[in-house]
Interface confidence: medium
């Protein structure tokens, strides 16, 4: 039987009356155009909604926007358009919300053609009040807040000037001209690229990378011949043009660009690209595009310095055209990532890693599912997950996979069961153990969200027809109840819940359409009365993450340690609450070969824990470049995975000798490059 229809599914008592008392409708006095919604701060309940409506006239486009504010998680809204002098707000810049709980908001206004500069509206009190400020430039990008100080803003102008404000947008200074890209680093540092010959496009590959640590008082050029740059974790990356040809290489710095090393990654040509898929303070996942328009490349994982890389996954799907990849960090369990590969027959398959890229496997077939038509063997197949690529291909997939750090182990995604991703209508699957096992949760495509740190899952069917029903589950998707939230169905446009999955409120957004008008409408449902009591100790059970073999002493060991979590029992209907903190108990493991990545020059054949020499490097000296010196590597093929905490056990030999020879890592004087790097 379909999930949720089993006899053992206990119904939540009197839920219709409880939810009806906590369902709040708000009809917006707007012609339907576009709507954008932003949460201001954490646990404040403040939501800003901007509606915009364009009327294309013969000569010009007439625009109108309205601003609404809620301070009760969307139950009630107040029209505050007068606070911004009824000005038309540019939606392409969105609402720039300050970091953390700063309460800061910047809205960028539309201004008339002949004006000297743009206009912004600023609030530092969670949008209770706004101050109008005329800018000395026309912004090209949204205002970017410094992560360390929300008073510091940067923006690029339409004339490629880099503008900085030190007093939350009150006063602006142009600190540099001819800027292509600017990013905040740590400690209020700004990194940016500049061009010399007229435009960013013309100078691609000949840009300079600059740094200012004092908001434009002084500058340091930290790179030349730059194609692009990126920040990830504690790493600064730059792709740099080689001297002799049109290829580029990645260089990496861990000291804000003072010193650089050449990453041991393949160089790429004009049509190829590099992409940082994920990065933390320990390591980086880097995608390197294959030559030609293949739509795939290779994932490499770095060492703790971001310099030496190991091949992690071949034929990784990453389209050059739309720039789509399915790479997903499963935030509900440490070390887990999901992505797609393009197989030789051009079918797309999902792969999962539980050890931060050390090994990849197919997703286990859900027990309550049949293999579909893509499967050669009807008894042996895998689950394949729909993510960004499927969405870009306009498949019937309304949402990407969902996981939340405080909803431990839960992953929800659209998928199909077979030998590859199917173009048929997908179903929704859930894993409660971080991706090891899966269950079909809902038939057909749905929108879904996690509330109360996993205590409630809410879903709405994806349909082209108007809807008036919401589904919810209090047992991690095993059983579902349906609730009719309105008599009059609405054309559904989205679910909105406070980021962080701690809230018990969900807002259903859509519009009503009658013969003459259409209007935006929201329904906010508070589930607090469904989860009537606070969870107690008895409601939680101990769960060992990454457990695959309870008989094994090393069961659950991933990246050198295991973690036991306190998790809510599926049968408990109670509130984790807004202050819920994930309780975990880590313990160190003995080292095994699983705690080591294959070293430079080695790779791990599929389904094998041993690292073997790359055939093309057999018999060669392993030499690589580090801080401008050539190093000789003596290794038996293994190096510890960054962030791995194992102790004792297996201990492969690894030694690096300084060859006292110069090599190419110093790309600031690229005329000296003469490296033998592979």
């Amino acid at each position: 039987s379909a999930p949720g229809e089993d006899e053992e599914c206990g119904r939540v008592r009197d839920f219709v009356a409880k939810l009806a008392n906590n369902t709040h409708q708000h009809v917006f006095d707007d012609l339907r155009g576009s709507v954008s919604l932003s949460w201001v701060g954490d646990s404040t309940g403040v939501i800003l909604v901007l509606t915009t409506f364009h009327v294309p006239l013969v000569i010009m486009t007439f625009g109108q926007s309205k601003l609404y504010r809620s301070e009760d998680y969307g139950k009630n809204f107040k029209d505050i358009t007068d606070l911004i002098n009824n000005t038309f707000i540019r939606t392409e810049f969105g609402m720039a919300i300050g970091p953390e709980n700063s309460g800061k908001v910047v809205l960028t206004a539309e201004v008339s053609g002949g004006s000297r500069g743009g206009r912004i509206f600023r609030s530092s009190d969670f949008a209770k009040n706004f101050v109008q400020t005329d800018l000395p430039f026309h912004p090209l990008t949204q205002m970017m807040y410094s992560p360390q100080n929300s008073d510091y803003l940067l923006a690029l102008s339409t004339e490629n000037g880099l503008w900085v404000s030190k007093n939350f947008g009150g006063k602006w200074e142009e600190i540099h001209k001819a800027v292509c890209l600017a990013k905040w680093g740590s400690d209020n540092t700004i990194f940016f690229t500049t061009y010399a010959n007229g435009s960013c496009k013309a100078d691609l590959g000949a840009l300079e990378l600059w740094r200012t640590s004092d908001l434009g008082k002084s500058f340091k050029t930290i790179g030349v011949k730059i194609y692009s740059f990126g920040l990830g974790g504690r790493f600064l990356f730059a792709s740099v043009m080689a001297d002799k040809d049109t290829t580029r290489r990645i260089h990496v710095s861990t000291d804000q660009g003072d010193t650089w090393s050449m990453a041991q990654l393949p160089s790429v040509g004009q049509e190829q690209f590099y992409s940082i898929l994920a990065a933390n303070d320990d390591m980086v996942f880097m995608h390197v595009d294959e030559p030609g328009d293949t739509g795939f490349g290779t994932i490499f994982t770095s060492d703790d310095r971001g310099i030496v890389y190991s091949k992690s996954l071949d034929r990784h799907l990453y389209t050059t055209t739309g720039g789509e990849t399915d790479f997903t960090n499963v935030t509900s369990l440490r070390g887990v990532y999901i992505t797609s590969v393009l197989s030789e027959d051009n079918s797309i398959q999902t792969m999962i890693t539980f050890d931060q890229g050390g090994r990849w496997t197919h997703l286990r077939k859900p027990e309550n599912s049949e293999c579909d038509a893509t499967a050669k063997n009807k008894n042996e197949c895998s689950l394949h997950i729909h993510a960004s690529y499927s969405i870009s291909q306009k498949l019937n997939v309304p949402m990407a996979p969902l996981s939340e750090p405080n909803a431990v182990g839960i992953v929800i995604a659209h998928g199909s069961v077979g030998d590859a991703i199917s173009v048929m209508v997908p179903d929704v699957y859930i894993s409660d153990d971080g991706g090891y096992s899966w269950t079909k949760m809902l038939e057909g495509p749905h929108y879904y969200t996690i509330l109360d740190s996993g205590g409630i899952i809410v879903a709405i069917e994806h349909s082209s027809r108007p809807i008036n029903v919401i589904k919810f589950s209090t047992d991690e998707g095993q059983c579902w109840q349906t609730y009719t939230f309105t008599r009059d169905p609405i054309y559904f446009t989205g679910l909105a819940s406070e980021p962080g999955a701690r809230s018990m409120n969900i807002s259903i957004w859509g519009f009503t359409e009658s013969f003459l008008t259409s209007q935006w409408v929201s329904y906010t449902i508070d589930f607090k009365d469904i989860l009537e009591r606070n969870c107690e100790e008895k409601d939680y059970t101990i769960w060992l993450a990454h457990s695959t073999d309870p008989e094994d002493y090393e069961d659950g060991c991933i990246l050198g340690y295991k973690e036991q979590f306190l998790r809510l029992r599926k049968s408990s209907v109670c509130q984790n609450g807004r202050d819920y903190v994930v309780t975990k108990q880590p313990s160190i493991c003995l080292c095994s070969l699983e705690d080591f990545l294959c070293d430079f020059g080695y790779y791990r054949p599929e389904n094998d824990s041993k690292c073997v020499e790359q055939p093309e490097l057999k018999g060669h000296d392993l030499e690589f470049c580090l801080y401008g010196r050539e190093e000789h590597l003596t290794t038996n093929g293994y190096r510890k995975i960054p962030g791995d905490k194992c102790q004792g056990g297996v201990n492969p030999v690894r030694e690096v000798k300084d060859l006292k020879k110069k090599c190419t890592s110093n790309f600031l004087s690229p005329e000296k490059q003469n490296s033998k790097s592979n």
């Epitope: 000037g161 142009e174 840009l207 300079e208 002084s218 340091k220 050029t221 004087s669």
Partner: antibody, heavy 117, light 108 residues
């Protein structure tokens, strides 16, 4: 210790050319913006030209635009000023200076350029 | 183009006295202003950068203040070695610089 040493000055006829060099030591030359500043005999200081650390961005005072070219060789830690179509009013002591913040924190001792027939 | 005006052109004072030198910009230069000291036959020496920051090795008797268009260099108590020409200089939005005409501080 930071040192800047200019050379290449001398006597040249109007319309002639000179190339000034400034050899830098004691700091990471390639990372810093560098400039040329001049001072006519008995007169005040006049900024001439500036170049970014990588050499990709340059600026000039209006009176020398199109005649002077600033450049640098980061492998040699050397800053250059190529001066063409020299005029009598270009006569000055030319200083090479390292930029810091809003100013120039280190200066060379200067090299004298005299334009006269 | 931003023009800097310095006043007075000459300041005649005795050792131990307080010297106040003024620099005015034709339009705002924010805090991007520096002060230099130059003695005959020598290269200029940076005293103050970013309007109020003392450069390395500069004695505490030198201080800078101001922002926007009006700036001041103060020497709290003149020492014999402080008699020299003082220049202000601005850095406009990018890599463009202008010097003021200078103020000569001589012994009364």
């Amino acid at each position: 210790e930071v040192q800047l040493l200019e050379s290449g000055g001398g006597l040249v006829q109007p319309g002639g050319s000179l190339r000034l060099s400034c050899e830098a030591s004691g700091f990471t030359f390639r990372s810093y913006v560098m400039s040329w500043v001049r001072q006519a005999p008995g007169k005040g200081l006049e900024w001439v030209s500036t170049i970014s650390g990588g050499g990709g961005n340059t600026n000039y005072t209006d009176s020398v635009k199109g005649r002077f070219t600033i450049s640098r060789d980061n492998s040699k830690n050397t800053l250059y000023l190529q001066m063409n179509s020299l005029r009598a009013e270009d006569t000055a002591v030319y200083y090479c200076a390292k930029n810091w913040g809003s100013g120039f924190d280190y200066w060379g001792q200067g090299t004298l350029v005299t334009v006269s027939s | 183009e931003i023009v800097l005006t310095q006043s007075p052109a000459t300041l005649s004072l005795s050792p131990g006295e307080r010297a106040t030198l003024s620099c005015r910009a034709s339009q705002s230069v924010s805090s991007y202003l520096a002060w230099y000291q130059q003695k005959p036959g020598q290269a200029p020496r940076l005293l103050i950068y970013d309007a109020s920051n003392r450069a390395t090795g500069i004695p505490a008797r030198f201080s800078g203040s101001g922002s926007g268009t009006d700036f001041t260099l103060t020497i709290s108590s003149l020492e014999p070695e402080d008699f020299a020409v003082y220049y202000c200089q601005q850095r406009s939005n990018w890599l463009i610089f202008t010097f003021g005409p200078g103020t000569k501080v001589d012994i009364k």
